[in-house]
């Protein structure tokens, strides 16, 4: 069918003279995609965030928006451009019919379009009881400066800024972007409207019950009186922060996002951009007793995502739900019956529970750490938060069985002193998303931009996997795990470390011809072995068992099954030294572990032999864990014997640098 669209390509309503760029077609071979919230009741059809390609200028964004309006008008559709984004993400927010999505997706510069959706405050319940005065803890930490060099932005409800706890500490910005309250009979009541934000501001920086008593805060209103907001409103809030940062650069910034909505590509992308601009973002994991990866901004890798525990270090239950969990959670923090400022009166206190409260604790801790060390990067701060956390105190039985291994058993704690951690080699474990069950499925785990991938391992609950390998992707190493035929899927597990001035590479040995097994070592001068990986193409590795002990004098060597290719991660960094530590059990065991000693950090974790009854290996804090199939299925043959291989490293250079500072 012939359509005379060409006649109207110059159609730019109200801006008739501007005709440049209107005839452009989308770049060849690129297809924009449409995304919407997986949780139907949270969807907001009729409002869309049109995200443009990364290098798009503001003028092009405006022109694209006008072009959409013009082409829509020609089809008889009304549209309204609600906001043009720039500074964080290029794009625009448009109110339009869903009928126009196909048209909008074909516009030049469009990367993807996301339907707007709701986000919610993550505290339950509100206004339980008034407790005046607040309870004091005898062991309450009294920091010297309490985060005074740091500014904490709070994106939440309105707040009662004249509350005794936060008066003079919180500056209420003029930013407000909230949806209408639901229900025709809803009455706005100031104390209810301010409840959530006031409490959280108190938890972060309150005079009596605050974590970082010296921190100054700025509040942005993105949640209405019912604690409900939108992804688009949150995006515009984050953009406001970025613009404020550019106009008036201050010291370190912490952004607290005590809210959650369904998984949102655009919200995660905005968080990533802000994080890469040097801002520390802390968010609530969510109160849905669910995988935090299904929610945003909790699922954004650059954000510090916080789950909630109670005074007994147990995961918080909230009615029929509770704290979220899983690989997208970085750590947990107190989130049950937390005493804080109540908006009922200027001296009232109240207890609230939820992952919002937990996130506020971590935002306070972050503010204090940054105040003590303002030059800390996001990666350094995250690693320190993990390092100083209480380990292995959470009862994992509360989590669904398949999530236990993925969920960090860490409860946030203030560092014993604000200085003196610089000598430490910090590492953390990053799990990939599940690969899915298809034969060729793979899973990829990535480290943060300023972290080094020092080792890569894999894990499959069924044991059907084809190992893992480190490979370059976009100029950085990533960890890729491979599923096997009949497998239910795999996880890739990256060991991500802070190693300044590191130069790391991967050395590979193809499957060996000889029966002795495959081996590879770090042959470059000054390079030390930080991790071993193995990958095989065969569906089922045989029971061939290579010699477990390495030849003397060759610590920089990875050994593995003769049918597998072996990959050694070899790094050169000032003062870096590493050693291999093995723990073998001759009888079949479901779990074998080996830990690094005090002063050494686990960088690599792998299993010997790599036979098919080994489910995989992964690092938990400073311990290497190797899991095998249920003993009852393997019998007690020598095939059941497994060795856990840990590579433990330390940096004399970091230790010296730290001593020089003191």
């Amino acid at each position: 069918q012939e359509d005379e669209d060409g006649d109207y390509e110059e159609l730019v309503l109200a801006l008739r003279s501007e005709e440049d760029g209107l005839a452009e077609a989308p770049e060849h071979g690129t297809t924009a995609t449409f995304h919407r919230c997986a949780k139907d009741p949270w969807r907001l059809p009729g409002t869309y965030v049109v995200v443009l390609k990364e290098e798009t200028h503001l003028s092009q964004s405006e022109r694209t928006a006008r072009r959409l309006q013009a082409q829509a008008a020609r089809r008889g559709y009304l549209t309204k451009i609600l906001h043009v984004f720039h500074g964080l993400l290029p794009g625009f927010l448009v109110k339009m019919s869903g009928d126009l999505l196909e048209l909008a997706l074909k516009l030049p510069h469009v990367d993807y379009i996301e339907e707007d959706s709701s986000v919610f405050a993550q505290s339950i319940p509100w206004n339980l009881e008034r407790i005046t005065p607040p309870r004091y803890r005898a062991d309450e930490y009294q920091p010297p400066d309490g985060g005074s060099l740091v500014e904490v932005y709070l994106l939440d409800t309105s707040i009662q800024s004249d509350h005794r706890e936060i008066e003079g500490r919180v500056m209420v910005t003029d930013f407000e972007n909230v949806p209408e309250e639901d229900g025709t009979r809803f009455h706005r009541q100031a104390s209810k409207c301010d409840s959530h934000g006031t409490h959280l501001a108190g938890v972060v920086s309150g005079r009596d019950a605050g974590v970082a008593k010296g921190a100054s805060m700025r509040s942005l209103r993105v949640l209405n009186c019912q604690g409900k907001g939108t992804v688009s409103g949150t995006l515009i809030g984050l953009e406001f922060i970025r613009k404020s940062q550019l106009v008036q650069p201050v010291g370190p910034l912490v952004v607290l996002l005590p809210l959650a909505g369904g998984y949102s590509r655009v919200l995660n992308a905005a968080c990533q951009r802000l994080a890469r601009a040097g801002v520390v973002l802390v968010t609530a994991a969510g109160n849905f007793r669910d995988d935090a990866c299904l929610y945003s901004p909790a699922s954004a890798p650059e954000v510090i995502t916080v789950g909630a525990t109670n005074a007994q270090d147990q995961p918080v239950t909230l009615g029929t739900l509770g704290t979220n969990f899983g690989r997208c959670v970085d750590l947990f923090a107190p989130g049950e019956d937390i005493i804080g400022a109540s908006s009922d009166c200027s001296t009232c206190f109240v207890s609230q529970s939820g992952t919002s409260q937990a996130a506020a604790h971590v935002a306070g801790i972050a503010a204090m750490m940054l105040s003590a060390e303002p030059e800390l990067t996001l990666a350094e701060l995250r690693q320190r938060l993990i390092h100083f956390s209480a380990k292995d105190v959470i009862n994992e039985a509360w989590f669904p069985e398949d999530q236990r291994v993925l969920t960090p058993n860490l409860v946030a704690a203030l560092p014993p002193s604000t200085h003196g951690a610089g000598w430490q080699l910090f590492c953390r474990t990053v799990w990939s998303a599940h690969s899915g069950p298809t034969r060729m499925a793979t899973a990829v785990a990535r480290c943060a931009p300023d972290e080094e991938l020092l080792s890569c391992s894999s894990f499959s609950r069924s044991g059907k996997r084809r190992g893992e390998r480190m490979e370059a992707q976009g100029g950085k190493l990533v960890c890729r795990a491979h599923n096997a035929f009949g497998g239910e899927g795999v996880y890739a597990i990256a060991r991500c470390c802070l190693l300044p001035q590191a130069n790391c590479s991967v050395h590979t040995a193809p499957p060996a011809e000889a029966s002795m097994g495959t081996r590879v070592h770090c042959h470059q001068q000054g390079h030390v072995l930080t991790g071993c990986s193995s990958h095989w193409e065969v569906e089922d590795l045989g029971t061939h068992k290579p010699p477990v002990l390495r030849p003397r004098g060759q610590p920089n060597q990875c050994v593995g099954h003769r049918e597998a290719s072996i990959h050694a991660s070899c790094c050169h960094a000032p003062g870096l030294e590493c050693k291999v530590k093995e723990h073998g059990i001759p009888a079949p065991q479901e779990q074998v572990t080996v830990a690094c000693e005090e002063g050494w950090t686990l960088t690599g974790c792998s299993a010997l032999p790599g036979t098919s009854h080994v489910l995989g290996a992964y690092a938990v804090d400073n311990t290497c864990v190797v899991r095998s199939r249920d003993v009852s299925t393997t019998g007690s043959t020598s095939e059941g014997a497994v060795t856990a291989v840990a590579i433990c490293c330390r940096s004399r250079h970091l230790a010296q640098a730290s001593q020089e500072l003191q």
């Epitope: 309006q69 020609r74 008889g76 559709y77 009928d99």
Partner: antibody
Framework: QVQLVESGGGLVQPGGSLRLSCAAS????????MHWVRQAPGKGLEWVSN????????YYADSVKGRFTISRDNSKNTLYLQMNSLRAEDTAVYYC???????WGQGTLVTVSS | DIVLTQSPATLSLSPGERATLSCRAS???????LAWYQQKPGQAPRLLIY???SRATGVPARFSGSGSGTDFTLTISSLEPEDFAVYYC?????????FGQGTKVEIK
């Protein structure tokens, strides 16, 4: 070229029903809002109803609400107006128009008289 | 509802003269959705101006539109014999869509 052809008009008694059709060609019919506009003899233009490209959204003038129903069949490139409980004041030439009213049909006359 | 009032009801002019037609809205109208039509006896309306000021395809340059908010104008710089007709303004940015009552441009 774009063409809109109305049909189905005629003489009908008050209280009766009629179904108008508008056959579209020369453009991607499902992309466009479509409208019905009427003009009583010697009078001005009056908008009657419209429907979105997918058919999911419809609007009506107060004067016809509850009596007229707009619909479309995108597979047949046809717009419809089902008119029930017709009154004398519904007598007019009925036009279908596309999108931003850039193309109109030639109109079909509906006469409501006893 | 947005009421559009056109003035004058009738405009008597000679060919070559300038015609100025006014359309006033009872409340502010988004000018993106303000249009002008020409209708001759026995014919369907024809779109002249969309977006308050943009000429539709094939419309001679002597036709121009202007205005914003509540006041809009259609100007015919020099009347040609074929321009004598009825002219309607219309807003379609709000439901119900409304038309002005029309201005008849007749030969003096």
């Amino acid at each position: 070229q774009v063409q809109l052809v109305e049909s189905g008009g005629g003489l009908v008694q008050p209280g009766g029903s009629l179904r108008l059709s508008c056959a579209a060609s020369g453009f991607t019919f499902s992309d466009y809002y479509m409208h019905w506009v009427r003009q009583a003899p010697g009078k001005g233009l009056e908008w009657v109803s419209n429907i979105s490209g997918s058919g999911s959204t419809t609007y009506y003038a107060d004067s016809v609400k509850g009596r007229f129903t707009i619909s479309r069949d995108n597979s047949k490139n046809t717009l419809y107006l089902q008119m029930n409980s017709l009154r004398a004041e519904d007598t007019a030439v009925y036009y279908c128009a596309r999108g931003m009213f850039d193309f109109w049909g030639q109109g079909t006359l509906v006469t409501v008289s006893s | 509802d947005i009421v559009l009032t056109q003035s004058p009801a009738t405009l008597s002019l000679s060919p070559g003269e300038r015609a100025t037609l006014s359309c006033r809205a009872s409340q502010s109208v988004n000018s993106n959705y303000l249009a002008w039509y020409q209708q001759k006896p026995g014919q369907a309306p024809r779109l002249l101006i969309y977006g308050a000021s943009s000429r539709a395809t094939g419309v001679p340059a002597r036709f121009s539109g202007s205005g914003s908010g509540t006041d809009f104008t259609l100007t015919i710089s020099s009347l040609e014999p074929e321009d004598f007709a009825v002219y309607y303004c219309q807003q379609w940015g709000d439901v119900p869509i409304t038309f002005g009552q029309g201005t008849k441009v007749e030969i003096k």
